[in-house]
Amino acid sequence: TPLGPASSLPQSFLLKCLEQVRKIQGDGAALQEKLCATYKLCHPEELVLLGHSLGIPWAPLSSCPSQALQLAGCLSQLHSGLFLYQGLLQALEGISPELGPTLDTLQLDVADFATTIWQQMEELGMAPALQPTQGAMPAFASAFQRRAGGVLVASHLQSFLEVSYRVLRHLAQP
């Protein structure tokens, strides 16, 4: 059933999430900037077809529209999406020495955000079953594919975070 913004989510949790989203957005932007500056891969829209052929998935947030937000479903989709991006970022490992530290920080920040969401779901008694394993992740056959994949994963993640931020900000409104 839909739950409005006056739901049972503590303000401290929502503010922590908003903080974490902005931290990850900063990490993601730094990765995008380095991919652009180092490899001239600056326009994710030019790589969409390659993204289809590589099988880079999107994470849905269909349970999170502000007009008919389903709290349990939305938090679950947020967590599942973050779990998906952990796997996608893992698949990018070894992208290049220059990008390694930025990618490492992004990976950990995404994992920490997933922890925050799960922790809150657990406290509300709505924690989902633990995902046993990651689904099939894209296999990058070349350095170019991995870098192009990096551009697309960072772009997808940023879109996911923008929606997440809007949802969380909506929930945080008194």
Epitope: R22, G26, Q86, P101, A114, T115, W118, A127, L130
Partner: antibody, heavy 119, light 112 residues
Amino acid sequence: QVHLQQSGAELARPGASVKMSCKASGYTFPIYTMHWIKQRPGQGLEWIGYINPSIGYANYNQKFRDKATLTADKSSSTAYMQLSSLTSEDSAVYYCARGGYGDSLFAYWGQGTLVTVSA
Amino acid sequence: DIVMTQAAFSNPVTLGTSASISCRSSKSLLHSNGITYLYWYLQKPGQSPQLLIYQMSNLASGVPDRFSSSGSGTDFTLRISRVEAEDVGVYYCAQNLELPYTFGGGTKLEIK
């Protein structure tokens, strides 16, 4: 309540390997990252790396990439660190600490495992 | 890597008076989200470290309000308003803005 129980002290020869454990209780183990930190006698703290048990992903401080191997067993809620090709420089106390964000980061530590490397 | 710098020893303090411990980072720890990713830990003799302060100025659960922390993006100060015997130990600052996480060398609180 959260508790991290580390394995006992290890005495090893130069060139040998050791594997220590950190058993977690009081929380859902796979959800949190587990970090490992080194402290040489009378010295400061050095971050070695972390394991994300939910996806089995480990990340290392470059300095320890060829020294440490981090693993986790979800069924027993235990994180492991193996140290290889031991030298006297590896003689230290090694701590596990639970990861997280904000007030959760390193809010819980194991009691430490002392590794002594001696011929 | 971000380098965290601390003096090895504090100025000796008398019990009941205030003490300050400083820390400097080689890069600003202030993120664009407004959070400063600076932490303080205390390691008492023979014990594991414990979290005191997170995100530069927030007191961790169970930490007495005698402890406070402030700073800019690169220079930080931990203050203990009324030092007690149980405060003795080594104080470490640490950053978690980016990997690898790094710690300062630690400052030993000296009692007169």
